[in-house]
Amino acid sequence: PRSIEVKYIGVKSAYVSYDAEKRTIYLNITNTLNITNNNYYSVEVENITAQVQFSKTVIGKARLNNITNIGPLDMKQIDYTVPTVIAEEMSYMYDFCTLLSIKVHNIVLMMQVTVTTAYFGHSEQISQERYQYVDCGRNTTYQLAQSEYLNVLQPQQ
């Protein structure tokens, strides 16, 4: 069998909401993956499991099942959304993310994704992880892979 390639493209969008009383941030992060099937036969994408970490703490998980079938020598782009919650011991981030006076509230998140593919009864898992900048202060739609290159703006006094 030839390889199945998984390429994490980046964050497509991040939609933010807050709970002021709980000092909690809710971020719905949509990511984009390219999965390439270099084989001369179809491959089933059984599931995608993803998790997001902030400061070494898992803040969100997602799992997609029975996703798609990728034909021979074909490539499919798949979007998946991970709902994340920044709260409790990280509630100090609420102050930063809700600062009106800061234009871009970028935080560094680690995106981890594992794609499980199947062909002829055989399963294969391919994992990727990437650090990404995400704006926790406003709803943002990113250009393809743009989020990789943003600078982190720390609050200055």
Epitope: Y18, T98, P155, Q156, Q157
Partner: antibody
Framework: QVQLQQSGAELVKPGASVKISCKGS????????MNWVKQRPGKGLEWIGQ????????NYNGKFKGKATLTADKSSTTAYIHLSSLTSEDSAVYFC????????????WGQGTSVTVSS | DVVMTQTPLSLPVSLGDQASISCRSS???????????LHWYVQKPGQSPKLLIY???NRFSGVPDRFSGSGSGTDFTLKISRVEAEDLGVYFC?????????FGGGTKLESK
């Protein structure tokens, strides 16, 4: 320390225009919104609008749209306000003020520039 | 626009007295993020305004603890526990919760 140095007083004729400058130093100029505030003699304060020097983004008080134009030059760390079609109502002291990140208030102000409109 | 109403317009005090200035807004100043953006400034003759209190009750750096702010929603108060000569000037409340940002008309704190 943060300093905002404004240009000197202006005496202009009605119908003319004027451009006031505000040079910021001692902080990351591009990353802070710069606000402009008007104060007429013996009167209160009026917020004109703000500019983000990093990308030139602006927010205006509707009352001053068409009257004031805000610009900024990152290379010289200077913000500008251009006031057009001046009348006696525009005679005032104009302040620039930085919007602080932590306190989320206008925590540093320029010394003010007096504009007098008179024929 | 949000109207900020300050009272009194003028406040004559004896040095050492307590002074209290009220500020009312025409609508709630609680932002959707839960914060209330009500600030207090003081302006002395011939000078630019200076930040005194931010977000209702937080003293700005270098501001003496005789200054305190309180309130919520639409009603706010600035108190000076023992007025000193250097405190005389015009005090303004200001809101930045809603655009356009607006200021109160000012309260002149003066010596009796």
């Amino acid at each position: 320390q943060v300093q905002l140095q404004q240009s000197g007083a202006e005496l202009v004729k009605p119908g003319a225009s004027v451009k006031i400058s505000c040079k910021g130093s001692g902080y990351a100029f591009s990353s802070y919104w710069m606000n402009w505030v008007k104060q007429r003699p013996g009167k209160g304060l009026e917020w004109i609008g703000q500019i983000y020097p990093g990308d030139g983004d602006t927010n205006y008080n509707g009352k001053f749209k068409g009257k004031a134009t805000l610009t900024a030059d990152k290379s010289s760390t200077t913000a500008y306000i251009h006031l057009s079609s001046l009348t006696s109502e525009d005679s005032a002291v104009y302040f620039c003020a930085r919007w602080g990140h932590y306190d989320e208030a206008m925590d540093d102000w320029g010394q003010g520039t007096s504009v007098t409109v008179s024929s | 626009d949000v109207v900020m109403t300050q009272t009194p317009l003028s406040l004559p005090v004896s040095l050492g007295d307590q002074a209290s200035i009220s500020c009312r807004s025409s609508q709630s100043l609680v932002h959707s993020n839960g914060k209330t953006y009500l600030h207090w400034y003081v302006q002395k003759p011939g000078q630019s305004p200076k930040l005194l209190i931010y977000k209702i009750s937080n003293r700005f750096s270098g501001v003496p603890d005789r200054f305190s702010g309180s309130g919520s929603g639409t009603d706010f108060t600035l108190k000076i526990s023992r007025v000193e000569a250097e405190d005389l000037g015009v005090y303004f409340c200001s809101q930045i919760t809603h655009v356009p940002w607006t200021f109160g008309g000012g309260t002149k704190l003066e010596s009796k």
